[in-house]
């Protein structure tokens, strides 16, 4: 399957957070997305093949890595003045 | 900082097994990525020999592969080159070599290289 | 294999000059991904070869503007806008797109 964590996160002004997706399905491609209260997913960012990720509609204010197959941590980063949010990680072949 | 550093010796005999060590700094050669021996001819070609991932799975390039093994040893941070059967043609600089953060496979951590001259 | 075509095989060029360098592959590197694994590498005498550009034309973190990188399909081009002294050096294109991951033969950059 597939699991992200942790299932809530605070985080301290000025700070730097990082979200974990760990996968097991042999999955080569994986996608970080983010919603807001009352819209759709928007796709921050995707990755296709380990160590090769591209930005995806709202990539500002986050970064990844793809160190390895089954894992594609996103960090919010201080510059994200924005961060509250649900956050939805997925993978697919 | 990604480091590497190969060793071994800079002289074979013909028909004798190469063996070669990359020792890396900085990063845990189980954590990601994919660990790579590259080898520049005498006359500046360069050739992919194959890598070792992260998870111990390797791929080769097929021209050597009946020849080549690539295998790790995680308690030194380490992954080492055995090629068999050397002839004067594999006479190279060979270098250890590992990707940057986010290029694909494209590499930009490299070892010195180590000259290796297949002589009698 | 790939086979990975540079051309010129040698070049000489004055410090200021504009500099194209091509590379011709043997099959589409175009990745089932859709992204394209053509990579340019520069290296100079007694050294390791140094990434420049990847993925065609992402110029690698430290590297001058002047140098950008360009193409499609089977077809790839290496630019320096303006060579400096420290540009003259042997450049290599690569693709990662199909296993063996292959080299262009180098072409040797020389003042003129």
């Known amino acids: 399957g597939i699991t992200q964590s942790p299932k809530y996160l605070f985080r301290k002004e000025g700070q730097n957070v990082t979200l974990s997706c760990e996968q097991n399905l042999n999955h080569d491609a994986m996608y970080w997305y983010r919603q807001d209260p009352g819209q759709g997913l928007r796709l921050i960012y995707y990755s296709q093949i380990v160590n090769d990720f591209q930005k995806g509609d709202i990539a500002e204010g986050y970064s990844v890595s793809r160190e390895k197959k089954e894992s594609f941590p996103l960090t919010v980063t201080s510059a994200q003045k924005n961060p509250t949010a649900f956050y939805l990680c997925a993978s697919s072949i | 900082q990604v480091q590497l550093q190969e060793s071994g010796p800079g002289l074979v005999k013909p028909s004798e097994t190469l063996s070669l060590t990359c020792t890396v700094s900085?990063?845990?050669?189980?954590?990601?990525?994919?660990w790579n021996w590259i080898r520049q001819f005498p006359g500046k070609g360069l050739e992919w020999i194959g890598y070792i991932s992260y998870d111990g799975s390797n791929n080769y390039n097929p021209s050597l592969k009946s020849r080549v093994t690539i295998s790790r040893d995680t308690s030194k941070n380490q992954f080492s080159l055995k090629l068999s059967s050397v002839t004067a043609a594999d006479t190279a600089v060979y270098y250890c070599?590992?990707?940057?953060?986010?290029?694909?496979?494209?590499?930009?951590?490299w070892g010195q290289g180590t000259t290796v001259t297949v002589s009698s | 294999d790939i086979q990975m075509t540079q051309s010129p095989s040698s070049l000489s060029a004055s410090v200021g000059d504009r500099v194209t360098i091509t590379c011709r592959s043997s099959q589409s590197l175009v990745h089932s991904n859709q992204n394209t694994y053509l990579h340019w590498y520069q290296q100079k005498p007694g050294k390791a070869p140094k990434l420049l550009i990847y993925?065609?034309?992402n110029r690698f973190s430290g590297v001058p503007s002047r140098f950008s990188g360009s193409g499609s399909g089977t077809d790839f081009t290496l630019t320096i806008s303006s060579l400096q002294p420290e540009d003259f050096a042997t450049y290599y294109c690569s693709q990662s797109t199909h296993v063996p991951f292959t080299f262009g033969q180098g072409t040797k950059l020389e003042i003129k």
């Open positions: 070599a590992s990707p940057s953060p986010g290029t694909g496979y494209a590499v930009d951590y």
């Open positions: 993925k065609v034309s």
């Open positions: 900085g990063y845990s050669i189980t954590s990601g990525y994919f």
